[in-house]
């Protein structure tokens, strides 16, 4: 009876289990009855990092120095290039595909440390009594308007985006 | 295209004054928190001086508090450095940068070169 799961590193094909190809080889042709899967080695800018059943394997990263990026790992048969950005500018995400020269702390964040050449802006949330409404590299959280130092009450809270809104006190008649 | 134009560096001697200049096209300025960061000689970026979209709040860093204003003119989509008292330590590439500042988007800086 034909088999309707195969084991781990392999694949079902036409009622069979065929081998996937290890990682850095890519698939010529399943297997048959009477012969194995064939597989062969990725080429020389390409990587597969699977067992597999591709018949292309990926190209590797392109680090673009026009964007900024530069190679932190090169690439192999089994693993993709890692680029990385250049001395003082800092990768947008986690896959560094561009450079930013710092990013910014959205509102209700703060600047807790300028960005250096080695590391990129660090941002806190503002906590209770202080905000932030911008996105910046440089501005801290800022405390909430005192509004009894005007003589005036809080007509509309704060949070950490927004400052309080004072208003003049009800005068009693 | 965003574009980033510094002008006013050249060779002045310790003590003295420059006042450098980044005209900016291609994005709406008067939006944009805008930096001066800096290249000495075979050293990394320093960052220098920082001023918010309405003018009205700034950052220097610690080698140049008290030395250089940052200040800039929204109507004319320019940004400026007043550099007094300049060190031959603040001989470098001066390059202007809006926030968030794209690699391929940055200029080609001016170069101030502090010395007798």
């Known amino acids: 009876e034909p088999p309707t799961a195969c084991r781990e590193k392999q694949y079902l094909i036409n009622s069979q289990c065929c081998s996937l190809c290890q990682p850095g080889q890519k698939l010529v042709s399943d297997c048959t009855e009477f012969t194995e899967t064939e597989c062969l080695p990725c080429g020389e800018s390409e990587f597969l990092d699977t067992w597999n059943r591709e018949t292309h394997c990926h190209q590797h990263k392109y680090c673009d120095p026009n964007l900024g990026l530069r190679v932190q790992q090169k690439g192999t048969s089994e693993t993709d290039t890692i680029c990385t950005c250049e001395e003082g500018w800092h990768c947008t995400s986690e896959a560094c595909e561009s450079c930013v020269l710092h990013r910014s702390c959205s509102p209700g964040f703060g600047v807790k440390q300028i960005a250096t050449g080695v590391s990129d802006t660090i941002c806190e949330p503002c906590p209770v009594g202080f905000f932030s409404n911008v996105s910046s590299a440089f501005e801290k959280c800022h405390p909430w308007t005192s509004c009894e130092t005007k003589d005036l009450v809080v007509q509309q809270a704060g949070t950490n985006k927004t400052d309080v809104v004072c208003g003049p006190q009800d005068r009693l008649r | 295209e965003v574009q980033l134009l510094e002008s006013g560096g050249g060779l002045v001697q310790p003590g003295g004054s420059l006042r450098l200049s980044c005209a900016a096209s291609g994005f709406t300025f008067r939006d944009y928190e805008m930096w001066w960061v800096r290249q000495a000689p075979g050293k990394g970026l320093e960052r220098v001086s920082a001023i918010n979209p309405q003018g009205t709040r700034t950052y220097y860093a610690d080698s140049v508090k008290g030395r250089f204003t940052i200040s800039r003119d929204n109507s004319k989509n320019t940004l400026y450095l007043q550099m007094n008292s300049l060190r031959a330590e603040d001989t470098a590439v001066y390059y202007c940068?809006?926030?968030?500042?794209?690699?391929?988007?940055r200029g080609q800086g001016t170069l101030v070169t502090v010395s007798s």
């Open positions: 940068a809006k926030l968030p500042q794209l690699f391929h988007d």
